[in-house]
């Protein structure tokens, strides 16, 4: 902790400006008013403070706001955000999407840090649900964000937010997560016509039940093998050879290359050989 010493005559800071980079740590402590700093946080980012100087500035804010910074300060933290611990962030009440964006921008290009994860958690809990604008923002910064949530957390995503989800946002989701997201997607896209509906729902089909796959097989959707391989095994097993043929359309030939992998392997073992032979792919049940 920096020792408390009187501010030298004439050095009391009236503004947060460039001159402060020449202040020693003890001078910053003694001469920079915490309330002034809180008010002019937006200026800190334009000044090349050292890490040690930033520690002093953070200490001053912590002393003024030990129970958590007000949002007016949080929004302008800039790179001082990188000095915050998850414990600091848990004290915050962040309600503005602009504040969230400003802080995510600071961490842009890096992996999601514990600080960012805590910030997002505080923000989402404060809002009560993952609304579309929030999801848009989070997936723009962290494409894998959605798949980092537990099924319980995903249950708070309203169907309307599903419109913000891009296929790549679901790349790392496991079946349990897709089980939660699929019904929401189905609800969100229910008023779309056949081909448009399939384009939108395709990424979520890893959570689809058998009856929905059967329904899709009647719509000439031509599902690609990559999507088929992500389907739930228990949903694929009851499908007939004819239904799989209709579901995959021209992509059915790809089954041969995947015959040793789930769910294709398990599905083949459930079929009558006569039915498999109708595909002319040499699949052995």
């Amino acid at each position: 902790e920096v020792e408390k010493t009187a501010c030298p005559s004439g050095k009391k800071a009236r503004e947060i400006d460039e001159s402060l980079i020449f202040y020693k740590k003890w001078e910053l402590e003694a001469c920079v008013d915490a309330a002034l700093l809180a008010t002019q946080m937006d200026r800190v980012n334009a000044i090349p403070f050292t890490y040690e100087q930033l520690d002093v500035l953070k200490h001053k804010l912590d002393e003024l706001y030990p129970q958590g910074y007000p949002e007016s300060v949080i929004q302008h933290l800039g790179y001082l955000f990188l000095k915050m611990s998850p414990e600091d962030i848990r004290k915050w009440n962040v309600t503005s999407l602009e504040t969230l964006k400003a802080l995510l921008e600071v961490n842009k290009g890096h992996e999601m840090s514990p600080q960012v994860a805590t910030l997002i958690d505080r923000f989402v809990k404060g809002r009560g649900q993952l609304d579309k604008d929030t999801l848009d923002t989070l997936t723009a910064f962290y494409p894998g964000y959605l798949c980092s949530l537990s099924p319980e957390e995903l249950s708070s995503v309203p169907p309307s937010s599903i419109w913000a989800v891009r296929p790549q946002d679901l790349d790392t989701c496991d079946p349990r997560q897709l089980d939660v997201l699929y019904p929401k997607a189905r609800l969100a896209f229910q008023n779309m016509n056949g081909s448009e509906y399939f384009v939108k729902i395709q990424s979520f089909l890893g959570g689809a039940p058998t009856e929905d796959l059967k329904a899709l097989s009647q719509q000439n959707v031509s599902m690609d093998l990559a999507t088929f391989m992500k389907l739930r095994t228990d949903a694929v097993l009851p499908l007939t050879v004819a239904e799989v043929q209709k579901l995959l359309g021209p992509h059915v030939e790809g089954l041969k290359a995947e015959e040793r992998h789930r769910p294709v392997r398990d599905w083949i073992l459930r079929q009558r050989q006569d039915d498999l032979d109708t595909l002319g792919l040499g699949l052995q049940g």
Epitope: C7, A35, L36, E63, Y65, P66, Q67, P70
Partner: antibody, heavy 114, light 110 residues
């Protein structure tokens, strides 16, 4: 979470006195604590604060007249020599946020008289 | 040290009316201003901190505003239980100007 002051009594001028602020449910390593006083029928007056690091800050008029110290559950206010002007109810309070104090004790009355 | 000047010294308002109390700091205290309510024989009770943030348990009819040297506490739709003395408190213990209270405003509810 509560705060209670004790040690207030009738004393003669020049007498030293120690007031004790006892906290319950408040971790003094997480909260700064302040001392204030209020003369009968008058307004509130700030004496000083001890922060979580143990550093003490005093109002300019109180420097040399009072000493603030703490243990793990108490915060003491020592006055080496009281005068009639020090007659007041003394309050201890928890520093909260943004310059404010949120949990106040009921106060302890100090009367300095011949 | 910062000096806080509070006006008026007293205010009388019927139930349902609006009370406005002003507080002026001798130098800029930015947003570091709190308002307290005190009833006879009781300690002060925190109402507002950081100029405009309502303290936990404080009724929403209390509103704080201002910045720098000029601050206002407004009580809209004043109730009988609001009869008390109100103090502004400016400044911050860790900085050179320290903490100072306004002289108080006694609010009488008719």
């Amino acid at each position: 979470q509560s705060v209670k002051e004790s040690g207030g009594r009738l004393v003669t001028p020049g007498t030293p006195l120690t007031l004790t602020c006892t906290v319950s449910g408040i971790d003094l390593s997480s909260y700064a604590m302040g001392w204030f006083r209020q003369a009968p029928g008058k307004g509130l007056e700030y004496i000083g604060t001890i922060n979580i690091g143990g550093r003490v800050y005093y109002a300019s008029w109180a420097k040399g007249r009072f000493t603030i110290s703490r243990t793990s559950t108490t915060v003491d206010l020592k006055a080496p020599s009281l005068t009639a002007e020090d007659t007041a109810t003394y309050f201890c309070a928890r520093y909260y946020n943004g310059g404010s104090y949120d949990i106040w004790g009921p106060g302890t009355l100090v009367t300095v008289s011949l | 040290d910062v000096v806080m000047t509070q006006t008026p010294a007293s205010a009388s308002e019927p139930v349902g009316g609006t009370v406005t109390i002003k507080c002026q700091a001798s130098e800029s205290i930015y947003r570091v201003l709190a308002w307290y309510q005190q009833k006879p024989g009781q300690p002060p009770k925190l109402l507002i901190y950081d100029t405009s943030t309502l303290a936990s348990g404080a009724p929403s009819r209390f509103k704080g505003s201002g910045y720098g040297t000029e601050f206002t506490l407004t009580i809209s739709g004043v109730q009988c239980e609001d009869a008390a003395t109100y103090y502004c408190q400016g400044g911050y213990y860790a900085d050179s100007y320290g903490i100072a209270f306004g002289g108080g405003t006694e609010v009488v509810v008719k």
